[in-house]
């Protein structure tokens, strides 16, 4: 169950999809990826206040226990709910080829 | 790909399964759950240093970009990789019934 999408911390402060531009060098991929030279990495960033985009029952439990024991139990964390696949031109010993990666770019986000 | 399981921060400091004892009151469940009165909640807690239990390519990217832009990109987060189901005796308008919840207790953990 995806709980409330209203962010009590103000617009854009809570868990949501962000895009970060990164070069192959930034990613440490220059030795095994030929293209693209730059990737628009979509990732999940932001706070997870009480019940905001709670992914499941476990996330709701985590919220309750974090409120009670903040030093022991961390707040839920903003992570991908699903991914968009991406193709890379990959260098191998036998040459270059197109390879699809299913878990590279976040598609949407939730708190867990 | 689950990357290295060696924790560079010292034993028990990195992302792993913890058990937290919680009452129905702690969980805010007293009004809709009859039993159990207390739950041994298994949850994922701990740091996610570079490539420790990286869940996938996205987690590896996050590690690289966090190193470059720590104020913009957070480190990967310790979350459940899978869950153990649990049965609860649930109160309803028509009485009580056994209900199984698949996403309540963490089974194992990874960094994402």
């Amino acid at each position: 169950a995806r709980n409330g999408d209203h962010c009590p911390l103000g617009p854009g402060r809570c868990c949501r999809l962000h895009t970060v531009r990164a070069s192959l060098e930034d990613l440490g991929w220059a030795d095994w990826v030929l293209s693209p030279r730059e990737v628009q990495v979509t990732m999940c960033i932001g706070a997870c206040p009480s019940q905001f985009r709670a992914a499941n029952m476990h996330a709701q439990i985590k919220t309750s226990l974090h409120r009670l024991k903040p030093d022991t139990v961390p707040a839920p964390c903003c992570v991908p709910a699903s991914y968009n696949p991406m193709v890379l031109i990959q260098k191998t010993d036998t040459g270059v080829s197109l390879q699809t990666y299913d878990d590279l770019l976040a598609k949407d986000c939730h708190c867990i | 790909a689950r990357n290295g399981d060696h924790c560079p921060l010292g034993p028990g400091r990195c992302c792993r399964l913890h058990t937290v004892r919680a009452s129905l009151e702690d969980l805010g469940w007293a009004d809709w759950v009859l039993s159990p009165r207390e739950v041994q909640v298994t949850m994922c807690i701990g740091a996610c240093p570079s490539q420790f239990r990286a869940a996938n390519m996205h987690a590896q990217i996050k590690t690289s970009l966090h190193r470059l832009k720590p104020d913009t990109v957070p480190a990967p987060c310790c979350v459940p990789a899978s869950y153990n189901p649990m049965v609860l005796i649930q109160k309803t308008d028509t009485g009580v019934s056994l209900q199984t919840y698949d996403d309540l207790l963490a089974k194992d953990c990874h960094c994402i």
């Epitope: 030929l34 696949p85 991406m86 890379l88 031109i89 699809t100 770019l105 | -």
Partner: antibody
Framework: QGTLKESGPGILQPSQTLSLTCSFS??????????VSWIRQPSGKGLEWLAH???????RYKPSLKSRLTISKDTSRNQVFLKITSVDTADTATYYC??????????WGQGTTLTVSS | DIQMTQTTSSLSASLGDRVTISCRAS??????LNWYQQKPDGTVKLLIH???NLHSGVPSRFSGSGSGTDYSLTISNLEQEDIATYFC?????????FGGGTKLEIK
């Protein structure tokens, strides 16, 4: 590995509209970076790039033919289409579709032949 | 449009020979060049991507080189199955353009 197969009418009369279909498997056009191109080759001549469609529905056309070309896709059915209006005998050729990403056009279909004749 | 010129339209060589096919662009294409092989039955296969990168599965006797406007494809030890027409193609900018092709025949 990607496999692609073109299909078309085979024969058209001048001024008619050509509708080509590229059916593919082994990849998806929902994948970021992926695209499909159409290329043609008149018998005994060279290759001519016509159009390209990206995963995000961005399209590119050969400028001299742009007014006559329309490329489109049905991502869920793994198909790409090309329409050429007002065909002429100069459009008689073998038409290929090919998978492409970042300029790497790695797999081509076997081609479908079109003859324009009155 | 960028013009791609393959000056040699046909080439005759013996089995075992080293064969070089050249391609010139009308402007600098920054190594954004593919080489293709087209068999007599019309089948087209990618050999080289980005001027010098062998496509996976292509025999290592094929190699590509060049920079700026001048590029070449080399077959180091010609085999019977290499009888085909070879095309260069630039993808530096749209519209993508091909060379006229070089038909390779056995002496």
């Amino acid at each position: 590995q990607g496999t692609l197969k073109e299909s078309g009418p085979g024969i058209l009369q001048p001024s008619q509209t050509l509708s080509l279909t590229c059916s593919f498997s082994g990849f998806s056009l929902s994948i970021s970076g992926m695209g499909v191109s159409w290329i043609r080759q008149p018998s005994g001549k060279g290759l001519e790039w016509l159009a390209h469609i990206y995963w995000d529905d961005d399209k590119r056309y050969k400028p001299s033919l742009k007014s006559r070309l329309t490329i489109s896709k049905d991502t869920s059915r793994n198909q790409v289409f090309l329409k050429i209006t007002s065909v002429d005998t100069a459009d008689t050729a073998t038409y290929y579709c090919a998978r492409s990403a970042y300029g790497m056009t790695d797999y081509w279909g076997q081609g479908t032949t079109l003859t324009v004749s009155s | 449009d960028i013009q791609m010129t393959q000056t040699t339209s046909s080439l005759s060589a013996s089995l075992g020979d080293r064969v070089t096919i050249s391609c010139r662009a009308s402007q600098d294409i920054s190594n954004y060049l593919n080489w293709y092989q087209q068999k007599p039955d019309g089948t087209v296969k990618l050999l080289i991507h980005s001027a010098s990168n062998l496509h996976s599965g292509v025999p290592s006797r094929f190699s590509g080189s060049g920079s700026g406007t001048d590029y070449s494809l080399t077959i180091s030890n010609l085999e019977q199955e290499d009888i085909a027409t070879y095309f260069c193609q630039q993808y530096n900018m749209f519209p993508w353009t091909f060379g006229g092709g070089t038909k390779l025949e056995i002496k």
